[in-house]
Every structure is written in structure tokens, then in C-alpha cells.
């Protein structure tokens, strides 16, 4: 629980508690914003981001965004609050321990995004279909 000597300020989103009233600690995420990337046509890639940040707010999760257009490929790594859209998309997989890339519709580019909730989980971004729970065979395995 929140120790009595820690003041719980009004409207304080820096103190987030779990179901037991214990103070939730923040996520540790790769945080290099947007960088050029050589990640292309691979099942998974490392971010090559050397900066691991303590997310500012405990409710934030790790996010990675992979974008490819006619000119270049970029990879973005950040912390973000899953209650808020990112690049106009909801972070639907924020509770996942792995960053499983899902394609999003964006005109003029190929756009993949993932989010996850384990230490530095956006360092390893996974494109492979074998991890995608929209795969019916995998769903069979999960629910057996």
C-alpha cells in the first residue's frame, strides 16, 4: 500500500496503485524517438536503441513504431499511456510481454506498431506470423 509518509496529492497521475493499493512502479523502455532503421523483411529486429528510460508515469507502456515509405525506414521507440491513442491508434496489446508488430492502415507508407509491458520489451520487435494471435492455428494451441 501507499506508505503513510508518501503524500498522495490530488489528481496525481504520478502515483498509480494496483488492485491491492500498492504503488505501481514505472516501466523501463527503449526510448530513442524516431531513428533510421535497416530492419526490413525480417521476422524480428532489435531496436539498436542504446537509451533505456524510466517512463515518466507508471501507467505508461513501451511502444515501437516501424514505418517504411519510398525514401526510408524508421523505427520509433517511446513510452506512452495506453489510455491515449498513439499516431491515432489505440494500443490494444499494451499488456503483452512481447512487442508483436501489427500493421495499421496509413496512406503512402507501410506502418506497423506494437506495445508491451515488460522491461525493455520494445527492444525486440517481432513481425513473425507465428506470434500473431490472429493466426487460427495458434489460437487452437492457446485454448487447448
Amino acid at each position: 500500500t501507499i506508505p503513510p509518509h508518501v503524500q498522495k496529492s490530488v489528481n496525481n497521475d504520478m502515483i498509480v496503485t494496483d488492485n491491492n493499493g500498492a504503488v505501481k512502479f514505472p516501466q523501463l523502455c527503449k526510448f530513442c524517438d524516431v531513428r533510421f532503421s535497416t530492419c526490413d523483411n525480417q521476422k524480428s529486429c532489435m531496436s539498436n536503441c542504446s537509451i533505456t528510460s524510466i517512463c515518466e508515469k507508471p501507467q505508461e507502456v513501451c511502444v515501437a513504431v516501424w514505418r517504411k515509405n519510398d525514401e526510408n525506414i524508421t523505427l520509433e521507440t517511446v513510452c506512452h499511456d495506453p489510455k491515449l491513442p498513439y499516431h491515432d491508434f489505440i494500443l490494444e496489446d499494451a499488456a503483452s510481454p512481447k512487442c508483436i508488430m501489427k500493421e495499421k492502415k496509413k496512406p503512402g507508407e507501410t506502418f506497423f506498431m506494437c506495445s508491451c509491458s515488460s522491461d525493455e520489451c520494445n527492444d525486440n520487435i517481432i513481425f513473425s506470423e507465428e506470434y500473431n494471435t490472429s493466426n487460427p492455428d495458434l489460437l487452437l494451441v492457446i485454448f487447448q
Epitope: T17, D18, N20, A22, V23, K24, F25, L28, I54
Partner: nanobody, 120 residues
Amino acid sequence: EVQLLESGGGLVQPGGSLRLSCAASGSTFTDDRMWWVRQAPGKGLEWVSAIQPDGHTTYYADSVKGRFTISRDNSKNTLYLQMNSLRAEDTAVYYCAEQDVKGSSSFDYWGQGTLVTVSS
């Protein structure tokens, strides 16, 4: 019973240095990730720095990068925070907190805090 006891706080002039200590007893200190967390008067918690159990991997908030250094001595069950180039905005109560990294998503143990005041 787990106890975390911070010390080393005090009044220091801007640009000065302080070294905080946090002594742990009755805990699984050597297996746990340790944190320094601060709370300025009337403000929320700020997660200042963290260190992995092995002591080799450290993390810092942007506001203290390059000025603060976290370390630990597992043989003494003690956590440290070396604070250099202190600024007025570093004034806060500093807490150490212990996180069981084997699946816990919340702070397991907290110290009582030590007050750092940066003022001329």
C-alpha cells in the same frame, strides 16, 4: 520484517553535492531491483533512478542524467545515490524502494525518506 533506512539528506547550496544511503535489513536485497524516488513539496512522486540486482545496469530520469549516480553494495545491503550539481528543483524527500523483480508490479518496501533541501 523488512526495513529500509535512508540517510544523508540535508541543506546544500546550488551546485553542491550530497550522497544518500539506504540501508536494508530483513530483505532479499541482493535479488531485488532498487529505486530512488523523490517527492517535492506538494508534488507527485518522481522516479529518479533504478539499479538492477547485479549493480551493473542503471537507469535515470532525464531530469537527473549526468548529475546523479546510483550504486549499491550488496555485501552491505546498502543502496547509494551520489547527487552532484544540485539545483533548487532537486529539493524533495528522497525515498528508497525495493522491487521484487520476479513478477511484482508494485513497490514492495519503502523507506521513511530523507529530506534534501537545495537553497542558497
